[in-house]
């Protein structure tokens, strides 16, 4: 697998997409994991809903969300309030039994905010508003965020 680089700005959200063959991975749950070292294990961060038919519902683990468009074949991971320690190598995975297929290897890079906001209003990251369905599958350690609460690029 080639590694795809996704660049996000510190303090903002980063959306990572992992396309896949929807028929080949039909019925399979998905996961997002962080690679520990070059040849180390991939530590699970968050996985899609236990019921595959509800994979479209966003699930949260802390500041990381996952949602799966099983018809279109796109797994989407959102990293909110991106921090320098979030930089690193990750994988999108398709789960079957105790096995996991790698859908995409992702290198997350965290950029300092280059924009100059001295003369501009705050910029806020584009975010989808949380729906009731999303909220009830969030892990207890995450909190509901008001729309516009996630910072978008500040300016330098």
């Amino acid at each position: 697998h080639n590694t795809t680089v996704f660049q996000g700005v510190a303090g903002q959200s980063l959306q990572v997409s992992c396309p896949y063959d929807s028929m080949k991975h039909w019925g399979r749950r998905k996961a997002w994991c962080r690679q520990l070292g070059e040849k180390g294990p991939c530590q699970r961060v968050v996985s899609t809903h236990n019921l595959w038919l509800l994979s479209f519902l966003r699930r949260w683990n802390g500041s990381t969300a996952i949602t799966d468009d099983t018809l279109g074949g796109t797994l989407t991971i959102t990293l909110r309030n991106l921090q320098p320690h979030d930089a690193g190598l990750y994988q999108c995975q398709s789960l079957h039994g105790s096995e996991a297929d790698t859908l995409r290897k992702v290198l997350v890079e965290v950029l300092a905010d280059p924009l100059d906001h001295r003369d501009a209003g705050d910029l806020w990251f584009p975010g989808e508003s949380e729906s009731f369905e999303d909220a009830h599958v969030e892990h207890s350690i995450s909190r509901s965020l008001l729309e516009g609460e996630i910072p978008f690029p500040p300016t330098s």
Partner: antibody, heavy 120, light 108 residues
Framework: QVQLVQSGAEVKKPGASVKVSCKAS????????IHWVRQAPGQGLEWMGI????????SYAQKFQGRVTMTRDTSTSTVYMELSSLRSEDTAVYYC?????????????WGQGTMVTVSS | EIVLTQSPGTLSLSPGERATLSCRAS???????LAWYQQKPGQAPRLLIY???SRATGIPDRFSGSGSGTDFTLTISRLEPEDFAVYYC?????????FGGGTKVEIK
């Protein structure tokens, strides 16, 4: 498919204003930043500013501060760039461009460009 | 403002040859903040490379980017007829984001 369609060419007199539109289609309008970049005839590219279609917040290049205004209409998935106090040096092709998910400050999908001519 | 200087201004090569384009920044730019574009006459630019070395979606692997600090390079390993165009580098390390003056790759 994903595309940005811009309004047609404009001819303006010095001191006037111009408003260029950029209609997005084929993707979720509020999930991607839109930038404006211009190119004078036979010249290079110049970044003007950025708008977040979700909240409407903006950041402009200092050179254009006070003269440029970027707005959006989410009901029509359209972004607007208005440039005032036009002078002959503003004669250029104006492009709107979308930032990809992979990197928020580069431009992967571009409009076809709008030629703005400033002449007395 | 970070000034980007591209060289050479024009590069005359034949199809199949290797093209090496240079972009020099007036101050150090992290490699994460540099992009390359291709522009053909009458068309909008096309994103080739971001983060100095990551190819954008759909870009052939004959295009590669490298460099860090103040010196960056775009390499086209084997020129195809459709590669003859103007190439621009862009930095996004600081506002305003700026572009180089461009390098024209023409058929020899």
């Amino acid at each position: 498919q994903v595309q940005l369609v811009q309004s047609g060419a404009e001819v303006k007199k010095p001191g006037a204003s111009v408003k260029v539109s950029c209609k997005a289609s084929g993707y979720t309008f509020t999930s991607y930043y839109i930038h404006w970049v211009r190119q004078a005839p036979g010249q290079g590219l110049e970044w003007m500013g950025i708008i977040n279609p979700s909240g409407g917040s903006t950041s402009y290049a200092q050179k254009f501060q006070g003269r440029v205004t970027m707005t959006r209409d989410t009901s029509t998935s359209t972004v607007y760039m208005e440039l005032s106090s036009l002078r002959s040096e503003d004669t250029a092709v104006y492009y709107c461009a979308r930032a990809p998910q992979e990197s928020p400050y580069v431009f992967d999908i571009w409009g076809q460009g709008t030629m703005v001519t400033v002449s007395s | 403002e970070i000034v980007l200087t591209q060289s050479p201004g024009t590069l005359s090569l034949s199809p199949g040859e290797r093209a090496t384009l240079s972009c020099r920044a007036s101050q150090s730019v992290s490699s994460s903040y540099l992009a390359w574009y291709q522009q053909k006459p009458g068309q909008a630019p096309r994103l080739l490379i971001y983060g100095a070395s990551s190819r954008a979606t759909g870009i052939p692997d004959r295009f590669s980017g490298s460099g860090s600090g103040t010196d960056f390079t775009l390499t086209i390993s084997r020129l195809e007829p459709e590669d003859f165009a103007v190439y621009y580098c862009q930095q996004y390390a600081g506002s305003p984001f700026t572009f180089g003056g461009g390098t024209k790759v023409e058929i020899k």
